[in-house]
C-alpha cells in the first residue's frame, strides 16, 4: 500500500525559516505533488506549491523554494514573516498523485518540542486520505 510521509523542520541558522519534506513510498510513477497548509488540498487548505515531473515547479508566498530531492521526495522552503504566518502551529499537507494508484495525502506539523535544525528522520505516517 502506498504511503506518504511528511516532516517539518525549523532551520538552525534562520529561526524564521522552515522546510517541509515529503515523500511517497509506493510502486507508481508520480505525476504531481501538491503542498498545502492549514489542511488538505481542496479541504480548507491553501496551496503552497505544485511540483510536476515534466513541467517543473511552482510556488506561492510564503513558500520560497520548491524542489525535488529525489524521484519520490520533495522539499519546500518557507519564509515566516512573523505573527501573520505562525508556521510553528500550522499543519502542512502533501498530496502525491501517482499512476496507477491515484492520489495519496498526509499531513504533519513542527514537533512541539523541536530544537532548531533538529528533527526525527522521515518516517511514514498514516495516510489521511486516498482519492
Amino acid at each position: 500500500t502506498p504511503e506518504v510521509w511528511v516532516q517539518v523542520q525549523m532551520e538552525a541558522t534562520e529561526l524564521s525559516s522552515f522546510t517541509v519534506h515529503c515523500g511517497f513510498l509506493g510502486p507508481g510513477s508520480i505525476s504531481l505533488v501538491t503542498v498545502s497548509w492549514g489542511g488538505p488540498d481542496g479541504a480548507g487548505g491553501t496551496k503552497l506549491a505544485v511540483l510536476h515531473p515534466e513541467l517543473g515547479t511552482r510556488q506561492w508566498a510564503p513558500a520560497r523554494q520548491a524542489r525535488w530531492e529525489t524521484q519520490s521526495s520533495i522539499s519546500l522552503a518557507l519564509e515566516d514573516s512573523g505573527a501573520s504566518s505562525p508556521f510553528a502551529n500550522t499543519t502542512f499537507c502533501c498530496k502525491f498523485a501517482s499512476f496507477p494508484e491515484g492520489s495519496w495525502e498526509s499531513c504533519g506539523s513542527l514537533p512541539p518540542s523541536s530544537d532548531p535544525g533538529l528533527s526525527a528522520p522521515p518516517t511514514p505516517v498514516p495516510i489521511l486520505r486516498a482519492d
Epitope: P27, G56, R67, W68, Q71
Partner: antibody
C-alpha cells in the same frame, strides 16, 4: 538557454589539491541541488555528492568524505568541487549535474578531465 | 549503499536488432530508477525516469520497465546512432548509485 559550463582540463601532481568549477547559466543555482559525479576511463559513474547552494549544506558518498569538498557561490552562480590529497585513483572525468526543478539530472556539464601524474 | 548490478557489460548487435539490458538493485528502490545514454565523448543524457517514463524527445524505440529490485531497458530496433554506453541509476536513497554500464556496439 540552460547550460552548465565546467572549467578546463587539469594536470596536477600527486598530493596536490585542485578546485573544479561549474558555471550555471539560464537558471539560478539556488533553485536546484548541484550534484557532482566521477567517471574513470572505461568505468561506471560514481556519485560524489550534492550541495544545496541556498545554505551550503552538502551530502557526500562516504567514499568521498575527506576527499571532496563541495561549495557554491550564489552571487556568481558557480558551484565548485575541491579534491585534496590527489592520487592516480583520482584521474577521471568529473561532471556537475543539476537536480531539483525536475526529479532527475536533466542537465550535465561537459565534464572536466583531471589527470594526476608526476 | 544500494548496489545496482547491470548486465550485460557489452552488446554487439546489428542494426534492426532488439536489445535488452537488465539492472538489479540490492534492495527495493520502488520505481526510483533512471536510464542514461552516454555517447562517446559526451555527457550522459536522460532517456527514462521512474523506471518507465520516457523523457521528452526520446524515441519510442527506447522503453523501460520494472519495480522493486528488477529493472529492464530495451531498444526495440537498434539504429546506428544508438552506439553508446547505457547506465541505470537509483536515487531512492543516498548515496545515489549507478550500474556499471552496458557498452552497445553495432556490427
Amino acid at each position: 538557454e540552460v547550460q552548465l559550463q565546467q572549467s578546463g582540463a587539469e594536470l596536477v601532481k600527486p598530493g596536490a589539491s585542485v578546485k573544479l568549477s561549474c558555471t550555471a547559466s539560464g537558471f539560478n543555482i539556488k533553485d536546484i541541488y548541484m550534484h557532482w559525479l566521477k567517471q574513470r576511463p572505461e568505468q561506471g559513474l560514481e556519485w560524489i555528492g550534492r550541495i544545496d547552494p541556498t545554505n551550503g549544506n552538502s551530502e557526500y558518498d562516504p567514499r568521498f568524505r575527506g576527499k571532496a569538498t563541495l561549495t557554491a557561490d550564489t552571487s556568481s552562480n558557480i558551484a565548485y568541487l575541491q579534491l585534496s590529497s590527489l592520487t592516480s585513483e583520482d584521474t577521471a572525468v568529473y561532471y556537475c549535474a543539476r537536480f531539483g526543478i525536475y526529479p532527475y539530472f536533466d542537465y550535465w556539464g561537459q565534464g572536466t578531465t583531471l589527470t594526476v601524474s608526476s | 549503499g544500494i548496489v545496482m548490478t547491470q548486465t550485460p557489460k557489452f552488446l554487439l548487435v546489428s542494426a534492426g536488432d532488439r536489445v535488452t539490458i537488465t539492472c538489479k538493485a540490492s534492495q527495493s528502490v520502488n520505481k526510483a530508477v533512471v536510464w542514461y545514454q552516454q555517447k562517446p565523448g559526451q555527457s550522459p543524457k536522460l532517456l527514462i525516469s521512474y523506471a518507465s517514463n520516457r523523457y521528452t524527445g526520446v524515441p519510442d524505440r527506447f522503453t523501460g520497465s520494472g519495480y522493486g529490485t528488477d529493472f529492464t531497458f530495451s531498444i526495440s530496433t537498434v539504429q546506428a546512432e544508438d552506439l553508446a554506453v547505457y547506465f541505470c541509476q537509483q536515487d531512492y536513497s543516498s548515496p545515489w548509485t549507478f550500474g556499471g554500464g552496458t557498452k552497445l556496439e553495432i556490427k
